[in-house]
């Protein structure tokens, strides 16, 4: 198809040699007046549109990439010539830097309605260079993280060595949709909830004398919860005595809460008294049966194969450990009556 | 440090079978579940099989009948039987043990590749 009719958007990824980063293309899609497919929101030049103009009410993920040869040759499909870059719905995602990502790529619905959808394309050139600006070491990274509860801010990775001041007007984007109320370099979350993660787009223009062009970043937004300030503690045994049968198998449950960490080095361990003595038993391994974002659960069983005389003399003691401090809970065993 | 290392990737020919398997260190306990993932070029990671502590599996409707995934909690390993395989289970494979609510101790990934 003739790609000359196309609207056409120049987009600088200015990439970092130090970390892992990715990058993505929306298919921004024109809305001339004509074209219906193009045509999805109508929306008066002073309305911001909540989606991308390619997101609206119809399905508009059945868009068609391709990247145009440096050399001429016939355009290429992206799905099936570039393994490292990924179509999700509207979106190209290309999942390693490069300056080989450098080049032209245009996108266009696959079902072309009428004869004005031919036009209804867009290309994009992407220029990829790596970071060469050593003035501005502590960029912020592509992967930022967001403490669940507290006050937090995500900022622009190309922009994060700029005051607030000599910043210029940043578009923001939060998994494909416009922020349209965030125009600053850095974006300020009162309270962080799960919600708050995703992939974050920032998007400046700069401009010489020539032309203008868009300078992208992306970066990954996590929600993580802040390391615990507890001990662990145990949920089971609650009774320090415990009735027991003599001559009957006998196992006995330790299950212990313990809070999130990002370095976790739990200990859960059963170790025997004997009036001066003690030891540390042989038990089964540990096992979480209970993993939320907040805290693991974990259960390790000491297992007596008949309870005799002798263990209703001895403590059992249940041991448990985090970097914050240790709990113990002991079990005093008790011979049934009747 | 908790460790997952996968091994046993290679080329086969379709019809063929494959044991991965990981080995845990570092770890005091045995997570709430472990799994296998894989990431094939251009695509998105996707888990394949999951195995819980009590023993109980899931498995992903692609391989579901001709994976296996096991456990030997005194050896500290993980396996995945993979047989009958396909062109399209040609991907990274990843071993991952779940902590805090996800998935988040991952190995470094061992290649399958089927081809004739």
């Known amino acids: 198809f003739n790609i000359s009719g196309c609207s056409t958007k120049k987009l600088l990824w200015t990439y970092s040699t130090r970390s892992e980063e990715e990058f993505v293309l929306f298919c921004d899609l024109p809305e001339p007046q004509k074209s219906h497919f193009c045509h999805r929101n109508r929306l008066s030049p002073k309305q911001v549109p909540e989606h991308l103009p390619f997101m609206g009410s119809n399905d508009l993920s059945d868009v068609q990439w391709y990247q145009q040869p440096s050399n001429g040759d016939p355009l290429e499909d992206i799905r099936k010539s570039y393994p490292h870059i990924i179509q999700d719905k509207c979106t190209l995602h290309f999942l390693t830097p490069g300056v080989n990502n450098s080049g032209s790529y245009i996108c266009r619905p696959k079902m072309i309605k009428s004869p004005y959808d031919v036009a209804c394309c867009v290309k994009m050139i992407l220029e990829v260079k790596p970071q060469t600006n050593a003035s501005c070491e502590y960029s912020a990274s592509h992967k930022q993280d967001l403490l669940l509860g507290s006050t937090g801010s995500i900022s622009c990775p190309s922009l994060s060595c700029q005051s607030d001041a000599q910043s210029p007007a940043v578009t923001w984007y939060k998994n494909g949709k416009l922020l349209s109320v965030e125009r600053s370099n850095r974006i300020v979350v009162d309270e962080v909830y799960d919600y708050h993660q995703g992939t974050y787009v920032c998007d400046y223009t700069q401009s010489d004398t020539v032309s203008s062009w868009t300078v992208r970043a992306v970066v990954q937004v996590r929600t993580i919860v802040g390391d615990t300030k507890l001990k662990p503690d145990i949920l089971d045994p609650v009774e320090d005595t415990l009735e027991v049968e003599l001559g009957k198998p006998l196992t006995i449950s330790c299950k212990a809460r313990f809070g999130f960490e990002r370095v976790f080095n739990p200990v859960i361990k059963w170790y025997i008294k004997d009036s001066d003595l003690e030891w540390e038993v042989s038990v089964p391994e540990a096992k979480s049966i209970k993993s939320t974002l907040k805290d693991e659960i974990i259960e390790r069983n000491i297992i007596l194969e008949k309870v005799t005389q002798r263990d209703l003399r001895r403590k059992f003691v249940c041991f448990v450990q985090n970097s914050i401090g240790n709990t113990t809970q002991s079990v005093q065993l008790k011979e049934k009556r009747g | 440090q908790v460790q997952l290392q996968e091994s046993g990737g290679g080329s086969v020919q379709p019809g063929g079978s494959l044991r991965l398997s990981c080995a845990a260190s570092?770890?005091?306990?045995?997570?709430?579940?472990m799994g296998w993932f894989r990431q094939a070029p251009g695509k998105e990671r996707e888990r394949v099989a999951s195995?819980?502590?009590?023993?109980?599996?899931t498995y992903a409707d692609s391989v579901n009948g001709r994976f296996t995934i096991a456990q030997d909690t005194a050896k500290n390993t993980l396996y995945l039987q993979m047989d009958s395989l396909k062109p399209e289970d040609t991907a990274m494979y990843y071993c991952?043990?779940?902590?805090?609510?996800?998935?988040?101790?991952w190995g470094q990934g061992t290649q399958v590749t089927v081809s004739s």
């Open positions: 570092g770890f005091t306990y045995i997570p709430a579940y």
């Open positions: 991952a043990a779940y902590q805090f609510g996800a998935f988040r101790v």
């Open positions: 195995i819980k502590t009590d023993g109980s599996t």
